[in-house]
Interface confidence: low
Amino acid sequence: AVNGTSQFTCFYNSRANISCVWSQDGALQDTSCQVHAWPDRRRWNQTCELLPVSQASWACNLILGAPDSQKLTTVDIVTLRVLCREGVRWRVMAIQDFKPFENLRLMAPISLQVVHVETHRCNISWEISQASHYFERHLEFEARTLSPGHTWEEAPLLTLKQKQEWICLETLTPDTQYEFQVRVKPLQGEFTTWSPWSQPLAFRTKPAALGKDT
């Protein structure tokens, strides 16, 4: 049996994945639950099994097709239901009319690489993954650099207000180890949120030349 309030949040990666998290205050006693996606204007539907991620929340990924296939458009709407088994039948625990392009969260940027590094600056590039062609150039990025002795939370955010898949980091300290992360967000969508941060890219600035001012 299930009691208590629940929260059901899903995001579309703009191509072929809807990721959902369902939080439930009351205890679930060995109950099997799933998310069912039923598009109003498509010839498919999809289900994924909710798996626990904490004491009171479960998550799953609806895989709609090949990673780069465009499975939904800006006018699609998908009825998403959380279904939990009660004996021989399924009970609807939560339901939402999901507008994919109003609830976007892209995949984290990939293929981070150092293009050029000097004593005080470093040029880094990256690629976006599984992002819809619908966005054209309507994307923005945030980047952060981890300096020695600091935490990621302390790192200042650098904002790129356009689709620019590179950055030139300035005023770095010579011969110093840094880490760099970037995330992406489409401009479209009322409930759109930032992608996860990319995997950190570690790099080291060049040492200052002997006898030169640093």
Epitope: W38, P39, D40, R41, R42, R43, W44, N45, T73, T74, V75, I77, T79, I95, Q96, D97, K99
Partner: antibody, heavy 119, light 106 residues
Framework: EVQLLESGGGLVQPGGSLRLSCAAS????????VHWVRQAPGKGLEWLGV???????DYNAAFISRLTISKDNSKNTVYFQMNSLRAEDTAVYYC?????????????WGQGTLVTVSS | DIQMTQSPSSLSASVGDRVTITCQAS?????MYWYQQRPGKAPRLLIY???NLASGVPSRFSGSGSGTSYTFTISSLQPEDIATYYC?????????FGQGTKVEIK
């Protein structure tokens, strides 16, 4: 058999309101979206809005300030209300449903109900 | 809004003729639909997803196209095909229709 039956049309005064019903049979409005389309006399088709299976709505921006689409799941009926009517709102109003809930296109239409806005 | 421009606005052809109607969208669309409307009747879906024949629709009707340019064809016009034909895009809200093409028999 899927059927849609509109009712509520007739003569309305300018500035008045209109409430149409679309009674569905052969399917449930909790499983399928229902759209509204109108056609002025001798003119083309104009999409007005939709109510989705879960109850959320999308409207044509040209009508958003005076249009409300709602439904009563227990009666399996969708309602269309438009306020501040003017002569140019005179039209046949249709409710329509997409094909198999899984493919696009308005495969099912009501017979339409004529609304005349005149004093 | 995406404007849908149909041409011609009307045409007259003989029974057995091949009839072609074009629909030009003001910007690129992914999905195109075609409807037939006989006088005093509700529209009837003929073509969905640009080129797929709706249930019960004769094979003389066909559709094609992509991007901003779409075509609807009746391979051999029949007397019962006298009607107005509409294209419709389902890629961006508001959903929009062409102004219609009236088909008559010579």
């Amino acid at each position: 058999e899927v059927q849609l039956l509109e009712s509520g049309g007739g003569l309305v005064q300018p500035g008045g309101s209109l409430r149409l019903s679309c009674a569905a049979s052969g399917f449930t409005v909790t499983s399928y979206a229902v759209h509204w389309v109108r056609q002025a006399p001798g003119k083309g088709l104009e999409w007005l809005g939709v109510i989705w299976s879960g109850g959320s709505t999308d409207y044509n921006a040209a009508f958003i300030s005076r249009l409300t689409i709602s439904k009563d799941n227990s009666k399996n009926t969708v309602y269309f209300q438009m306020n501040s009517l003017r002569a140019e709102d005179t039209a046949v109003y249709y409710c329509a449903r997409a094909g198999d809930a899984n493919y696009d296109g308005f495969a099912y239409w009501g017979q339409g109900t004529l609304v005349t806005v005149s004093s | 809004d995406i404007q849908m421009t149909q041409s011609p606005s009307s045409l007259s052809a003989s029974v057995g003729d091949r009839v072609t109607i074009t629909c030009q969208a003001s910007s690129s669309v992914s999905f195109m639909y075609w409807y037939q409307q006989r006088p005093g009747k509700a529209p009837r879906l003929l073509i969905y997803d640009t080129s797929n024949l709706a249930s019960g629709v004769p094979s003389r009707f066909s559709g094609s196209g992509s991007g901003t340019s779409y075509t609807f064809t009746i391979s051999s016009l029949q007397p019962e095909d006298i009607a107005t034909y509409y294209c419709q895009q389902w890629s961006t809200y508001p959903l929009t229709f062409g102004q219609g093409t009236k088909v008559e028999i010579k």
